[in-house]
Protein backbone atom coordinates (compact mmCIF):
# COMPACT_ATOMS: atom_id res chain seq x y z
CA UNK A 1 0.00 0.00 0.00
CA UNK A 2 1.50 3.28 -1.13
CA UNK A 3 0.31 5.72 1.53
CA UNK A 4 -0.12 9.49 1.64
CA UNK A 5 1.99 11.80 -0.48
CA UNK A 6 1.32 14.87 1.68
CA UNK A 7 4.42 15.89 3.59
CA UNK A 8 3.60 17.15 7.09
CA UNK A 9 7.11 18.59 7.49
CA UNK A 10 6.72 21.13 4.70
CA UNK A 11 7.27 21.12 0.92
CA UNK A 12 10.24 19.12 -0.30
CA UNK A 13 11.32 17.86 3.11
CA UNK A 14 9.89 14.35 2.88
CA UNK A 15 11.11 11.38 0.87
CA UNK A 16 11.37 12.29 -2.82
CA UNK A 17 13.56 12.06 -5.90
CA UNK A 18 16.57 14.38 -5.95
CA UNK A 19 19.19 14.84 -8.67
CA UNK A 20 22.86 15.07 -7.72
CA UNK A 21 25.45 15.86 -10.38
CA UNK A 22 28.54 13.68 -10.11
CA UNK A 23 31.71 13.26 -12.16
CA UNK A 24 33.36 9.93 -12.87
CA UNK A 25 36.00 10.93 -10.30
CA UNK A 26 33.29 11.57 -7.69
CA UNK A 27 31.92 8.09 -8.29
CA UNK A 28 35.30 6.38 -8.36
CA UNK A 29 34.63 5.26 -11.93
CA UNK A 30 37.31 7.18 -13.81
CA UNK A 31 39.51 4.13 -14.32
CA UNK A 32 36.84 1.93 -15.93
CA UNK A 33 34.15 4.17 -17.46
CA UNK A 34 34.65 6.30 -20.57
CA UNK A 35 31.19 7.80 -20.88
CA UNK A 36 29.24 9.62 -19.66
CA UNK A 37 31.82 11.88 -18.01
CA UNK A 38 29.21 13.29 -15.71
CA UNK A 39 26.12 11.58 -14.32
CA UNK A 40 22.90 13.19 -13.15
CA UNK A 41 22.36 10.71 -10.33
CA UNK A 42 18.73 10.48 -9.27
CA UNK A 43 18.39 9.31 -5.68
CA UNK A 44 15.84 9.16 -2.90
CA UNK A 45 16.37 11.64 -0.09
CA UNK A 46 14.12 12.98 2.65
CA UNK A 47 12.30 12.15 5.85
CA UNK A 48 9.72 9.39 6.25
CA UNK A 49 7.17 10.65 8.77
CA UNK A 50 4.25 8.47 9.86
CA UNK A 51 2.74 6.59 6.91
CA UNK A 52 4.27 8.92 4.30
CA UNK A 53 4.77 6.85 1.12
CA UNK A 54 4.83 3.63 3.17
CA UNK A 55 6.00 0.92 0.79
CA UNK A 56 4.24 -2.00 2.48
CA UNK A 57 2.98 -3.49 5.74
CA UNK A 58 6.53 -3.76 7.05
CA UNK A 59 6.98 0.01 6.70
CA UNK A 60 3.73 0.61 8.59
CA UNK A 61 4.92 -1.68 11.40
CA UNK A 62 8.26 0.10 11.50
CA UNK A 63 6.50 3.46 11.88
CA UNK A 64 4.42 2.15 14.80
CA UNK A 65 7.40 0.60 16.58
CA UNK A 66 9.61 3.64 15.99
CA UNK A 67 6.97 5.77 17.72
CA UNK A 68 7.04 3.36 20.70
CA UNK A 69 10.79 2.60 20.80
CA UNK A 70 12.64 5.39 18.96
CA UNK A 71 16.01 4.38 20.42
CA UNK A 72 15.64 0.76 19.27
CA UNK A 73 13.68 0.95 16.04
CA UNK A 74 14.65 3.52 13.40
CA UNK A 75 12.09 5.37 11.34
CA UNK A 76 11.41 4.06 7.85
CA UNK A 77 13.98 5.08 5.30
CA UNK A 78 13.63 6.77 1.91
CA UNK A 79 14.79 4.34 -0.79
CA UNK A 80 14.15 3.67 -4.49
CA UNK A 81 10.87 1.94 -5.35
CA UNK A 82 12.04 1.47 -8.94
CA UNK A 83 14.98 2.29 -11.17
CA UNK A 84 15.78 3.71 -14.58
CA UNK A 85 18.46 1.92 -16.56
CA UNK A 86 21.68 3.66 -17.53
CA UNK A 87 24.11 2.77 -20.29
CA UNK A 88 27.82 3.17 -19.67
CA UNK A 89 30.64 2.93 -22.16
CA UNK A 90 33.18 0.98 -20.17
CA UNK A 91 36.66 -0.37 -20.62
CA UNK A 92 37.05 -4.12 -21.05
CA UNK A 93 39.91 -6.56 -21.52
CA UNK A 94 39.51 -6.26 -25.28
CA UNK A 95 38.73 -2.57 -25.58
CA UNK A 96 35.38 -0.94 -24.82
CA UNK A 97 31.78 -2.08 -24.49
CA UNK A 98 28.30 -0.72 -23.91
CA UNK A 99 26.79 -2.00 -20.68
CA UNK A 100 23.33 -1.40 -19.30
CA UNK A 101 22.93 -1.11 -15.53
CA UNK A 102 19.34 -1.57 -14.42
CA UNK A 103 19.82 -0.54 -10.80
CA UNK A 104 21.74 2.68 -11.07
CA UNK A 105 19.31 5.61 -11.23
CA UNK A 106 16.34 5.84 -8.88
CA UNK A 107 13.07 6.44 -10.74
CA UNK A 108 10.58 6.56 -7.88
CA UNK A 109 10.86 6.62 -4.08
CA UNK A 110 9.08 5.15 -1.08
CA UNK A 111 9.61 4.66 2.64
CA UNK A 112 10.55 1.30 4.11
CA UNK B 1 26.52 -6.92 -6.23
CA UNK B 2 26.16 -7.93 -2.57
CA UNK B 3 29.34 -6.55 -1.02
CA UNK B 4 31.27 -7.38 2.13
CA UNK B 5 29.62 -8.77 5.21
CA UNK B 6 32.42 -7.73 7.55
CA UNK B 7 31.31 -4.91 9.83
CA UNK B 8 34.10 -2.38 10.43
CA UNK B 9 32.16 -0.79 13.32
CA UNK B 10 32.27 -3.90 15.49
CA UNK B 11 30.11 -7.03 15.90
CA UNK B 12 26.38 -6.48 15.54
CA UNK B 13 26.58 -2.74 14.79
CA UNK B 14 26.08 -2.95 11.04
CA UNK B 15 22.93 -3.64 9.05
CA UNK B 16 21.43 -6.98 10.09
CA UNK B 17 18.21 -8.74 11.05
CA UNK B 18 16.85 -7.91 14.52
CA UNK B 19 13.77 -9.28 16.26
CA UNK B 20 11.46 -6.90 18.12
CA UNK B 21 8.59 -8.29 20.17
CA UNK B 22 5.37 -6.35 19.65
CA UNK B 23 1.80 -6.72 20.87
CA UNK B 24 -1.28 -6.08 18.71
CA UNK B 25 -1.71 -2.87 20.69
CA UNK B 26 1.87 -1.78 19.88
CA UNK B 27 1.15 -2.31 16.20
CA UNK B 28 -2.27 -0.66 16.26
CA UNK B 29 -3.86 -3.90 15.13
CA UNK B 30 -5.98 -4.77 18.18
CA UNK B 31 -9.24 -3.78 16.48
CA UNK B 32 -8.83 -5.93 13.37
CA UNK B 33 -6.47 -8.82 14.18
CA UNK B 34 -7.39 -11.73 16.44
CA UNK B 35 -4.21 -13.78 16.23
CA UNK B 36 -1.35 -13.86 16.91
CA UNK B 37 -1.61 -11.70 20.02
CA UNK B 38 2.09 -10.99 19.90
CA UNK B 39 4.37 -10.74 16.86
CA UNK B 40 8.09 -11.39 16.70
CA UNK B 41 8.76 -8.66 14.17
CA UNK B 42 11.97 -9.22 12.23
CA UNK B 43 13.38 -5.98 10.88
CA UNK B 44 16.56 -4.56 9.45
CA UNK B 45 18.53 -2.31 11.78
CA UNK B 46 22.10 -1.10 11.80
CA UNK B 47 24.63 1.13 10.11
CA UNK B 48 25.63 0.89 6.46
CA UNK B 49 29.32 1.80 6.28
CA UNK B 50 31.14 1.94 2.97
CA UNK B 51 30.17 -1.02 0.70
CA UNK B 52 28.78 -3.08 3.60
CA UNK B 53 26.05 -5.30 2.11
CA UNK B 54 25.59 -2.88 -0.80
CA UNK B 55 22.41 -3.99 -2.55
CA UNK B 56 23.30 -2.75 -6.01
CA UNK B 57 25.15 -0.14 -8.05
CA UNK B 58 22.88 2.60 -6.70
CA UNK B 59 23.97 1.81 -3.15
CA UNK B 60 27.61 1.97 -4.19
CA UNK B 61 27.04 5.38 -5.80
CA UNK B 62 25.25 6.59 -2.68
CA UNK B 63 28.23 5.56 -0.54
CA UNK B 64 30.64 7.49 -2.78
CA UNK B 65 28.48 10.63 -2.86
CA UNK B 66 27.78 10.49 0.89
CA UNK B 67 31.53 10.52 1.46
CA UNK B 68 31.85 13.60 -0.75
CA UNK B 69 28.67 15.44 0.27
CA UNK B 70 27.56 14.14 3.67
CA UNK B 71 25.18 17.06 4.26
CA UNK B 72 23.39 16.52 0.95
CA UNK B 73 23.50 12.78 0.36
CA UNK B 74 22.61 10.40 3.22
CA UNK B 75 24.45 7.13 3.76
CA UNK B 76 22.78 3.99 2.43
CA UNK B 77 20.03 2.64 4.65
CA UNK B 78 19.45 -0.82 6.11
CA UNK B 79 16.28 -2.29 4.60
CA UNK B 80 14.80 -5.71 3.86
CA UNK B 81 16.21 -7.54 0.87
CA UNK B 82 13.44 -10.15 1.13
CA UNK B 83 10.48 -11.03 3.32
CA UNK B 84 8.95 -13.99 5.11
CA UNK B 85 5.18 -14.34 4.85
CA UNK B 86 2.99 -14.15 7.93
CA UNK B 87 -0.57 -15.39 8.42
CA UNK B 88 -2.99 -13.31 10.47
CA UNK B 89 -6.44 -14.28 11.69
CA UNK B 90 -8.37 -11.10 11.10
CA UNK B 91 -11.87 -9.81 11.64
CA UNK B 92 -14.06 -9.36 8.59
CA UNK B 93 -17.61 -8.13 7.93
CA UNK B 94 -18.84 -11.70 8.08
CA UNK B 95 -16.65 -13.08 10.86
CA UNK B 96 -13.02 -14.05 10.66
CA UNK B 97 -10.58 -14.90 7.90
CA UNK B 98 -7.04 -16.16 7.43
CA UNK B 99 -4.92 -13.69 5.50
CA UNK B 100 -1.31 -14.10 4.36
CA UNK B 101 0.86 -10.98 4.24
CA UNK B 102 3.96 -11.38 2.11
CA UNK B 103 5.66 -8.14 3.06
CA UNK B 104 5.44 -8.09 6.82
CA UNK B 105 8.52 -9.80 8.27
CA UNK B 106 12.01 -9.06 6.99
CA UNK B 107 13.94 -12.19 6.06
CA UNK B 108 17.27 -10.75 4.91
CA UNK B 109 18.81 -7.29 4.95
CA UNK B 110 20.94 -5.11 2.70
CA UNK B 111 22.02 -1.49 2.36
CA UNK B 112 20.54 0.82 -0.22
Amino acid sequence: ARNGDHCPLGPGRCCRLHTVRASLEDLGWADWVLSPREVQVTMCIGACPSQFRAANMHAQIKTSLHRLKPDTVPAPCCVPASYNPMVLIQKTDTGVSLQTYDDLLAKDCHCI
Amino acid sequence: ARNGDHCPLGPGRCCRLHTVRASLEDLGWADWVLSPREVQVTMCIGACPSQFRAANMHAQIKTSLHRLKPDTVPAPCCVPASYNPMVLIQKTDTGVSLQTYDDLLAKDCHCI
Epitope: L34, P36, M86, T92, S97 | -
Partner: antibody, heavy 121, light 110 residues
Framework: EVQLLESGGGLVQPGGSLRLSCAVS????????MTWVRQAPGKGLEWIGI???????YYASWAKGRFTISRDNSKNTVYLQMNSLRAEDTAVYFC???????????????WGQGTLVTVSS | DIVMTQSPATLSVSPGERATLSCQAS??????LAWFQQKPGQPPRLLIY???TLASGIPARFSGSGSGTEFTLTISSLQSEDFAVYFC????????????FGQGTKVEIK
Amino acid sequence: EVQLLESGGGLVQPGGSLRLSCAVSGFSLSSYDMTWVRQAPGKGLEWIGIISSSGNTYYASWAKGRFTISRDNSKNTVYLQMNSLRAEDTAVYFCARGILVYADYGDHNLWGQGTLVTVSS
Amino acid sequence: DIVMTQSPATLSVSPGERATLSCQASEDIYTNLAWFQQKPGQPPRLLIYAASTLASGIPARFSGSGSGTEFTLTISSLQSEDFAVYFCLGVYTYISAEGAFGQGTKVEIK
Protein backbone atom coordinates in the same frame (compact mmCIF):
# COMPACT_ATOMS: atom_id res chain seq x y z
CA GLU C 1 43.62 -13.14 -40.11
CA VAL C 2 40.76 -11.11 -38.63
CA GLN C 3 37.76 -10.95 -40.96
CA LEU C 4 34.06 -10.05 -41.04
CA LEU C 5 31.89 -11.44 -43.81
CA GLU C 6 28.29 -10.40 -44.34
CA SER C 7 25.82 -12.63 -46.21
CA GLY C 8 22.09 -13.05 -46.71
CA GLY C 9 21.44 -10.02 -48.90
CA GLY C 10 19.39 -10.14 -52.08
CA LEU C 11 16.11 -9.12 -53.61
CA VAL C 12 13.06 -9.10 -51.36
CA GLN C 13 9.51 -7.85 -51.90
CA PRO C 14 8.08 -4.93 -49.88
CA GLY C 15 6.63 -6.23 -46.62
CA GLY C 16 8.98 -9.19 -46.66
CA SER C 17 11.67 -10.26 -44.19
CA LEU C 18 15.35 -11.02 -44.44
CA ARG C 19 18.02 -12.20 -42.04
CA LEU C 20 21.57 -11.02 -42.63
CA SER C 21 24.56 -12.81 -41.13
CA CYS C 22 27.97 -11.50 -40.20
CA ALA C 23 30.46 -14.33 -39.74
CA VAL C 24 33.64 -13.35 -37.93
CA SER C 25 36.98 -15.11 -37.88
CA GLY C 26 40.34 -14.49 -36.25
CA PHE C 27 38.87 -13.37 -32.92
CA SER C 28 36.39 -14.52 -30.31
CA LEU C 29 33.05 -12.84 -30.93
CA SER C 30 31.97 -13.21 -27.30
CA SER C 31 34.45 -10.53 -26.18
CA TYR C 32 33.28 -7.79 -28.52
CA ASP C 33 30.38 -5.46 -29.19
CA MET C 34 29.22 -5.53 -32.83
CA THR C 35 27.61 -2.76 -34.85
CA TRP C 36 25.40 -2.80 -37.95
CA VAL C 37 25.49 0.15 -40.37
CA ARG C 38 23.79 0.60 -43.74
CA GLN C 39 24.28 2.81 -46.79
CA ALA C 40 21.62 3.44 -49.43
CA PRO C 41 22.96 3.74 -52.98
CA GLY C 42 24.69 7.11 -53.41
CA LYS C 43 23.74 8.16 -49.87
CA GLY C 44 25.41 8.52 -46.49
CA LEU C 45 26.01 6.02 -43.70
CA GLU C 46 23.19 5.14 -41.32
CA TRP C 47 23.74 3.63 -37.85
CA ILE C 48 21.34 0.76 -37.23
CA GLY C 49 22.35 -0.59 -33.83
CA ILE C 50 24.75 -2.45 -31.58
CA ILE C 51 24.75 -5.73 -29.73
CA SER C 52 27.06 -5.65 -26.72
CA SER C 53 29.33 -8.47 -25.60
CA SER C 54 26.85 -9.14 -22.79
CA GLY C 55 23.99 -9.43 -25.29
CA ASN C 56 22.24 -6.10 -24.70
CA THR C 57 20.94 -4.44 -27.86
CA TYR C 58 20.68 -0.76 -28.73
CA TYR C 59 18.93 0.58 -31.82
CA ALA C 60 18.43 3.76 -33.78
CA SER C 61 14.89 4.98 -33.08
CA TRP C 62 13.83 4.35 -36.70
CA ALA C 63 15.02 0.70 -36.47
CA LYS C 64 13.22 -0.22 -33.24
CA GLY C 65 10.47 -2.75 -33.76
CA ARG C 66 11.40 -3.75 -37.31
CA PHE C 67 15.08 -4.68 -36.94
CA THR C 68 16.52 -7.10 -34.40
CA ILE C 69 20.20 -7.79 -33.75
CA SER C 70 21.24 -11.10 -32.21
CA ARG C 71 24.38 -13.17 -31.84
CA ASP C 72 25.46 -16.79 -31.65
CA ASN C 73 28.89 -16.83 -30.05
CA SER C 74 29.28 -20.56 -30.64
CA LYS C 75 28.95 -19.94 -34.39
CA ASN C 76 30.96 -16.68 -34.21
CA THR C 77 28.10 -14.99 -36.06
CA VAL C 78 26.00 -11.87 -35.58
CA TYR C 79 22.59 -11.50 -37.19
CA LEU C 80 20.35 -8.68 -38.36
CA GLN C 81 16.72 -9.70 -38.71
CA MET C 82 14.76 -7.22 -40.84
CA ASN C 83 10.97 -7.32 -41.02
CA SER C 84 8.28 -5.34 -42.89
CA LEU C 85 10.85 -4.22 -45.42
CA ARG C 86 10.25 -1.12 -47.52
CA ALA C 87 11.83 0.28 -50.67
CA GLU C 88 13.78 2.78 -48.57
CA ASP C 89 15.54 -0.10 -46.80
CA THR C 90 17.42 -0.81 -50.03
CA ALA C 91 21.07 -0.44 -49.06
CA VAL C 92 24.41 -2.10 -48.54
CA TYR C 93 24.47 -3.47 -44.99
CA PHE C 94 27.79 -3.55 -43.13
CA CYS C 95 28.77 -5.15 -39.85
CA ALA C 96 31.69 -3.76 -37.89
CA ARG C 97 33.50 -4.75 -34.72
CA GLY C 98 33.23 -2.55 -31.65
CA ILE C 99 31.18 0.52 -30.87
CA LEU C 100 33.24 2.46 -33.44
CA VAL C 101 33.62 5.72 -31.50
CA TYR C 102 36.30 4.12 -29.31
CA ALA C 103 38.84 1.63 -30.56
CA ASP C 104 39.24 -1.92 -29.40
CA TYR C 105 42.74 -3.15 -28.71
CA GLY C 106 44.57 -4.36 -31.80
CA ASP C 107 42.85 -3.69 -35.12
CA HIS C 108 41.09 -0.34 -35.13
CA ASN C 109 39.08 -0.67 -38.31
CA LEU C 110 37.23 -3.92 -38.71
CA TRP C 111 34.39 -3.72 -41.21
CA GLY C 112 32.94 -6.29 -43.54
CA GLN C 113 32.64 -5.54 -47.26
CA GLY C 114 28.86 -5.31 -46.98
CA THR C 115 25.90 -7.18 -48.47
CA LEU C 116 23.35 -5.54 -50.77
CA VAL C 117 19.67 -5.70 -49.91
CA THR C 118 17.21 -4.63 -52.60
CA VAL C 119 13.56 -4.17 -51.67
CA SER C 120 11.44 -4.07 -54.79
CA SER C 121 8.37 -5.64 -56.32
CA ASP D 1 17.16 11.12 -30.87
CA ILE D 2 20.73 12.19 -31.44
CA VAL D 3 21.36 14.14 -34.64
CA MET D 4 24.82 14.76 -36.09
CA THR D 5 25.18 17.71 -38.47
CA GLN D 6 28.22 18.05 -40.70
CA SER D 7 29.40 21.14 -42.52
CA PRO D 8 30.14 21.99 -45.19
CA ALA D 9 28.43 19.47 -47.47
CA THR D 10 31.22 19.93 -50.02
CA LEU D 11 34.70 21.33 -49.53
CA SER D 12 36.84 22.30 -52.54
CA VAL D 13 40.51 22.35 -51.63
CA SER D 14 43.79 22.39 -53.54
CA PRO D 15 46.38 19.69 -52.85
CA GLY D 16 48.75 20.79 -50.10
CA GLU D 17 46.14 23.05 -48.51
CA ARG D 18 44.53 22.63 -45.10
CA ALA D 19 40.98 21.27 -44.80
CA THR D 20 38.74 21.78 -41.79
CA LEU D 21 35.53 19.77 -41.43
CA SER D 22 32.94 20.36 -38.70
CA CYS D 23 30.50 18.09 -36.93
CA GLN D 24 27.88 19.18 -34.42
CA ALA D 25 25.95 16.87 -32.06
CA SER D 26 22.43 17.61 -30.85
CA GLU D 27 23.33 16.18 -27.42
CA ASP D 28 26.40 16.31 -25.23
CA ILE D 29 28.31 13.22 -26.35
CA TYR D 30 31.55 13.99 -24.46
CA THR D 31 34.23 12.42 -26.68
CA ASN D 32 32.04 9.62 -28.07
CA LEU D 33 32.89 10.58 -31.63
CA ALA D 34 34.75 9.07 -34.57
CA TRP D 35 35.69 10.27 -38.05
CA PHE D 36 35.62 7.98 -41.10
CA GLN D 37 36.86 8.32 -44.64
CA GLN D 38 35.01 6.53 -47.42
CA LYS D 39 35.88 6.01 -51.06
CA PRO D 40 33.45 4.59 -53.67
CA GLY D 41 32.81 0.86 -53.38
CA GLN D 42 34.70 0.53 -50.10
CA PRO D 43 33.63 0.24 -46.47
CA PRO D 44 34.40 3.25 -44.27
CA ARG D 45 37.92 3.61 -42.88
CA LEU D 46 38.37 4.78 -39.28
CA LEU D 47 40.59 7.87 -38.98
CA ILE D 48 39.95 9.28 -35.52
CA TYR D 49 38.27 7.79 -32.45
CA ALA D 50 37.48 9.25 -29.02
CA ALA D 51 37.23 12.63 -30.81
CA SER D 52 40.98 13.17 -31.00
CA THR D 53 42.89 9.87 -31.06
CA LEU D 54 44.50 8.88 -34.34
CA ALA D 55 43.66 5.33 -35.42
CA SER D 56 46.55 2.99 -36.17
CA GLY D 57 48.03 3.34 -39.64
CA ILE D 58 46.50 6.78 -40.23
CA PRO D 59 48.90 9.55 -41.31
CA ALA D 60 49.62 12.30 -38.77
CA ARG D 61 48.25 14.97 -41.11
CA PHE D 62 44.80 13.94 -39.84
CA SER D 63 43.78 15.32 -36.44
CA GLY D 64 40.57 15.60 -34.47
CA SER D 65 39.47 17.95 -31.72
CA GLY D 66 36.45 18.92 -29.69
CA SER D 67 34.18 17.47 -27.03
CA GLY D 68 30.57 17.85 -25.98
CA THR D 69 28.70 19.03 -29.06
CA GLU D 70 31.32 20.63 -31.34
CA PHE D 71 33.95 18.59 -33.20
CA THR D 72 36.50 19.24 -35.92
CA LEU D 73 38.53 17.10 -38.29
CA THR D 74 41.59 18.78 -39.74
CA ILE D 75 43.71 17.55 -42.63
CA SER D 76 46.83 19.68 -42.42
CA SER D 77 48.08 19.25 -45.98
CA LEU D 78 45.80 17.46 -48.42
CA GLN D 79 47.27 14.66 -50.48
CA SER D 80 45.69 13.29 -53.64
CA GLU D 81 44.51 10.14 -51.80
CA ASP D 82 42.61 12.28 -49.26
CA PHE D 83 39.93 13.35 -51.71
CA ALA D 84 36.95 11.35 -50.50
CA VAL D 85 33.79 11.59 -48.39
CA TYR D 86 34.20 12.04 -44.62
CA PHE D 87 31.62 11.06 -42.02
CA CYS D 88 31.44 11.72 -38.29
CA LEU D 89 29.71 9.24 -35.97
CA GLY D 90 28.46 10.14 -32.51
CA VAL D 91 27.13 7.82 -29.82
CA TYR D 92 24.96 9.19 -27.04
CA THR D 93 24.48 7.16 -23.88
CA TYR D 94 22.28 7.75 -20.88
CA ILE D 95 19.14 5.76 -20.19
CA SER D 96 19.79 4.02 -23.50
CA ALA D 97 22.39 4.31 -26.25
CA GLU D 98 21.99 5.55 -29.78
CA GLY D 99 24.37 6.38 -32.57
CA ALA D 100 24.10 8.60 -35.63
CA PHE D 101 26.31 9.54 -38.55
CA GLY D 102 26.55 13.02 -39.98
CA GLN D 103 25.38 13.38 -43.57
CA GLY D 104 28.96 13.53 -44.81
CA THR D 105 31.37 16.09 -46.27
CA LYS D 106 32.76 15.55 -49.74
CA VAL D 107 36.31 16.83 -50.07
CA GLU D 108 36.99 17.50 -53.73
CA ILE D 109 39.89 18.88 -55.73
CA LYS D 110 39.68 22.59 -56.34
